[in-house]
Interface confidence: low
């Protein structure tokens, strides 16, 4: 949950690609004003997930979740939260 | 803001070699089945995407990272 808060649009696009849902991918890419060539490129990546099946999608989703919830990322998230708290305190 | 480790993973998926990408994945999930899957996906992307496609995908990532939704 915390990871998606850090950059929700990234996880929207990633899970749309890995899920193999073209409509969902189009909707996500519209949010960042992706051009037609950019959409084509992202669909080629999506094709790889579709071709390799459900297990492949689950495994890669697991990798992304593991990286996003690793100490490398969580340490960063905690640091950012501390910085935000400092800024909020200073702003009062 | 996106976590640098995630950014690196995605960058290597597009612009790294299969070895570099798999080594990066192994730092987080060293299961043989996961690493084999990572290599298969990486090889598939390398086979399907031209250099221009990869530039376009990187451009999408730039738009994502600079989006207000990130």
């Amino acid at each position: 949950v915390k990871m998606a808060e850090t950059c929700p649009i990234f996880y929207d696009v990633f899970f749309a690609v890995a899920n193999g849902n073209e409509l969902l991918l189009d909707l996500s890419l519209t949010k960042v004003n992706a051009t037609e060539p950019e959409r084509t490129a992202m669909k080629k990546i999506q094709d790889c997930y579709v071709e390799n099946g459900l297990i492949s999608r689950v495994l890669d989703g697991l990798v992304m979740t593991t990286i996003s919830s690793s100490k490398d990322c969580m340490g960063e998230a905690v640091q950012n939260t501390v910085e935000d708290l400092k800024l909020n305190t200073l702003g009062r | 803001e996106i976590c640098p480790a995630v950014k690196r993973d995605v960058d290597l998926f597009l612009t790294g070699t299969p070895d570099e990408y798999v080594e990066q994945v192994a730092q987080y999930k060293a299961l043989p089945v996961v690493l084999e899957n990572a290599r298969i996906l990486k090889n598939c992307v390398d086979a399907k995407m031209t250099e221009e496609d990869k530039e376009n995908a990187l451009s999408v990532l730039d738009k994502i990272y600079t989006s207000p939704l990130c």
Partner: antibody
Framework: EVQLVESGGGLVKPGGSLRLSCAAS????????MNWIRQAPGKGLEWVSY????????YYADSVKGRFTISRDNAKNSLFLQMSSLRAEDTAVYYC??????????????WGQGTLVTVSS | EIVMTQSPDFQSVTPKEKVTITCRAS??????LHWYQQKPDQSPKLLIK???QSFSGVPSRFSGSGSGTDFTLTINSLEAEDAATYYC????????FGQGTKVEIK
Amino acid sequence: EVQLVESGGGLVKPGGSLRLSCAASGFTFSDYYMNWIRQAPGKGLEWVSYISSSGNSIYYADSVKGRFTISRDNAKNSLFLQMSSLRAEDTAVYYCARDGRYNDRRRGYYWGQGTLVTVSS
Amino acid sequence: EIVMTQSPDFQSVTPKEKVTITCRASQSIGSSLHWYQQKPDQSPKLLIKYASQSFSGVPSRFSGSGSGTDFTLTINSLEAEDAATYYCLQSSSLRTFGQGTKVEIK
């Protein structure tokens, strides 16, 4: 200019040991995967071993597994190949080679000039 | 282990002729395929990396194509200096060379 210079080759008896070195210059050594590749006299190229940039990932061809050890010293821009239990079929020119990267067409695979290892009694 | 099968083993060609060398991988290797040229008593020189990327300084008559399992090296209008042995190398999973193709000038 990228340069790779191998040394340490020579004549050795079967069962003996030898340590090859490769001195790298002209690029950021610690950024690249490095390989040892060999070529027996009059034969084709055979990949021997590679080591990742950090040294975390190491792989060997089945023909040398358990007998050869690859290592690197990033501080000294050096690559090594420790060879033991040498056999006549290990006789070859040994090349040190730098891997390329996908996204920069100037960063190709570079090779040294090679060092000859002869295993004979 | 990925096996690389190169063909033909030998080719005798007249100058200005077009040369085609193929390399087949036993399983998909994406675009992780490189082509080398080796002349007698010299170390191999990279011609094409990642299936189709020309390496800097390599004459434009050398080109590469293919992805997945089938790859081709093409030498358009062969020159005398192109007499050499050509090898393909896969770097998708470990490293494997093809057995080589010797190109001789008639």
